[in-house]
Interface confidence: low
């Protein structure tokens, strides 16, 4: 006869490990006893349990409540045992010794491998700002046994680099994702993907990118200068920009205070019925925590009663300042 077993038994941390040992013999042969031992290079052979054909399972005190027989029905030639709730300390070599009648004794060894699934964590990098060079967007760390694989899933262009730290019973892998921040990345997902043989499916942690930026400012409302005539109602100037964080808007007049009745409402400057007093240079100031930008326009209010007055071209200029 011979023993049927496995060279390597692999389980996930906390699972029950089935240590297989089946005697394949002639029809008239019987298994009297199976002795299980842990073979440790430092501590030598330690008894785990005795499985007797008549008296059943007798577990060594060191493994009490941890070793069981597989659930019935059980073949009398099956000497397999279950090691409950495998932990990393259970990793190592195990031996089954089978005493048969009349063929004698057989023995086999197997290695128990305990997979420790990683518990990944994602740490965002420093705040991202448009205009920075290559910058850390996020790092992802996962520790397990064996070493997990840590990669990134994203549409964003960037570079990833990994490093490993090996501990006595596990390995920690950290992967960093670097990118050159641009506003198009704002709101884009950056997903850390952790693969490991102890996981049924990859573990994924998603970080949403936030890139601080501030667009150039421009002013809308002066497209048709002829509309800016004395007496017109509802005239407005609207400041256009975008940014992250969302910018704040402010309006001033370059050549003095805002005329009476001119109202600032966020990005919009609202005028009362126009008079020539509303002519002047208006400045829209846009700012967020990253920087600030200005756009100025010249408003010329035309008086239809003064036909000799020529229409001036509207001029605009833009400035920006970084904080």
């Amino acid at each position: 006869g011979e023993l049927e077993t496995s060279d390597v038994v692999t389980v996930v941390l906390g699972q029950d490990a089935k240590l297989p040992c089946f005697y394949r013999g002639d029809p008239d042969e019987q298994v009297g006893q199976v002795a299980w031992a842990r073979v440790d290079p430092n501590e030598g052979i330690r008894e785990l349990a005795l499985l007797h054909s008549k008296y059943g399972l007798h577990v060594n005190p060191a493994y009490e409540d941890r070793v069981e027989q597989p659930p019935p029905p059980r073949d009398p030639l099956d000497g397999s045992v279950l090691l409950r709730n495998a932990v990393q300390a259970d990793e190592g070599e195990y031996e089954c010794r089978v005493s048969t009648f009349p063929a004698g004794s057989f023995q086999a060894r197997m290695r128990l491998r305990v997979l420790v699934p990683p518990l990944p964590s994602l740490n965002p990098g420093p705040p991202l700002e448009e205009g920075q060079g290559l910058t850390l967007a996020a790092s992802c760390t996962a520790e397990g046994s064996p070493a997990p694989s840590v990669t990134w899933d994203t549409e964003v262009k960037g570079t990833q680099s990994s490093r490993s730290f090996t501990h006595p019973r596990s390995a920690a892998v950290t992967s960093e994702f670097h990118l050159v921040p641009s506003r198009s990345m704002n709101g884009q997902p950056l997903t850390c993907v952790v693969s490991h043989p102890g996981l049924l499916q990859d573990r994924r942690i998603t970080h949403t990118l936030q890139v601080a930026f501030l667009a150039e400012a421009s002013v809308r409302g002066l497209e048709d200068q002829n509309l800016w005539q004395v007496g017109r109602e509802g005239a407005t100037l609207k400041c256009l920009s975008e940014g992250q964080p969302p910018p704040k808007y402010n309006w001033t007049r370059l050549d003095g205070p805002l005329p009476s009745g001119v109202r600032v409402k966020g990005d919009t400057l609202g005028f009362p019925p126009l008079t020539t007093e509303h002519s002047g240079v208006y400045v829209c100031h846009v700012s967020n925590e990253l920087s600030s930008r200005d756009s100025q326009v010249t408003v010329e209010v035309l008086d239809p009663e003064d036909p000799g007055k020529q229409v001036d071209l509207v001029s605009a200029s833009h400035h920006h300042h970084h904080h």
Epitope: D65, N85, L119, N123
Partner: antibody, heavy 120, light 107 residues
Framework: EVQLLESGGGVVQPGRSLRLSCAAS????????MHWVRQAPGKGLEWVAV????????YYADSVKGRFTISRDNSKNTLYLQMNSLRAEDTAVYYC?????????????WGQGTLVTVSS | DIVMTQSPSSLSASVGDRVTITCRAS??????LAWYQQKPGKVPKLLIY???TLQSGVPSRFSGSGSGTDFTLTISSLQPEDVATYYC?????????FGQGTKVEIK
């Protein structure tokens, strides 16, 4: 559904003993570390003790070391805290808490707590 | 032993406000930090572990960050149901101590 139910609290005189129990259900009790955490009236949380999934390893806060003993009976799905030489400062609600894994040592489920009052 | 210190000890904010609570360890603990929420008269609830990993079922307005000694719990938009005391806890080695707690109230 994971359930943890503490019992054994009450009023006790200083220097006396008390034994708390925590009955667990809804998960494989023998696969998880278990902890005791306490909270004095109107105060914050204080970790007291942990026992490994199999009872082989135990750790205690300095404030209870030598006086309290944590134990478990996996066949009964029950966690215990034997409290000896009780002091007034041991007055608190005692929670049993399930470890997130076999020894991560943070807690994903808590019992409702049992009040221990040490007073003469 | 490592001491965990939270700040502020209490705060009052309006619904919709961004709320930030910090937790500092007296020695580095890598990212072995958990955050718990305890509503008045209730048992603590796990919010975040590994410093920044959101526990299943916790609303996404909660987030955590930090590593080493300095950690932050952020509520991006405070809701009335977020009134509670929040605790940090380190779990790299025994004793598994908590911060003293931060009480969050609505203005």
């Amino acid at each position: 559904e994971v359930q943890l139910l503490e019992s054994g609290g009450g009023v006790v005189q200083p220097g006396r003993s008390l034994r708390l129990s925590c009955a667990a259900s809804g998960f494989t009790f023998s696969s998880y570390g278990m902890h005791w955490v306490r909270q004095a009236p109107g105060k914050g949380l204080e970790w007291v003790a942990v026992i490994s999934y199999d009872g082989s390893n135990k750790y205690y806060a300095d404030s209870v070391k030598g006086r309290f003993t944590i134990s478990r009976d996996n066949s009964k799905n029950t966690l215990y805290l034997q409290m000896n030489s009780l002091r007034a400062e041991d007055t608190a609600v005692y929670y049993c808490a399930k470890d997130y894994g076999y020894n991560w040592n943070f807690f994903d489920y808590w019992g409702q707590g049992t009040l221990v009052t040490v007073s003469s | 032993d490592i001491v965990m210190t939270q700040s502020p000890s209490s705060l009052s904010a309006s619904v919709g406000d961004r709320v930030t609570i910090t937790c500092r360890a007296s020695q580095g603990i890598s990212n072995y930090l958990a955050w718990y929420q305890q509503k008045p008269g209730k048992v603590p609830k796990l919010l975040i572990y590994a410093a920044s990993t959101l526990q299943s079922g916790v609303p996404s307005r909660f987030s955590g960050s930090g590593s080493g000694t300095d950690f932050t719990l952020t509520i991006s938009s405070l809701q009335p149901e977020d009134v509670a005391t929040y605790y940090c806890q380190k779990y790299n080695s025994a004793p598994y101590t908590f911060g003293q707690g931060t009480k969050v109230e609505i203005k």
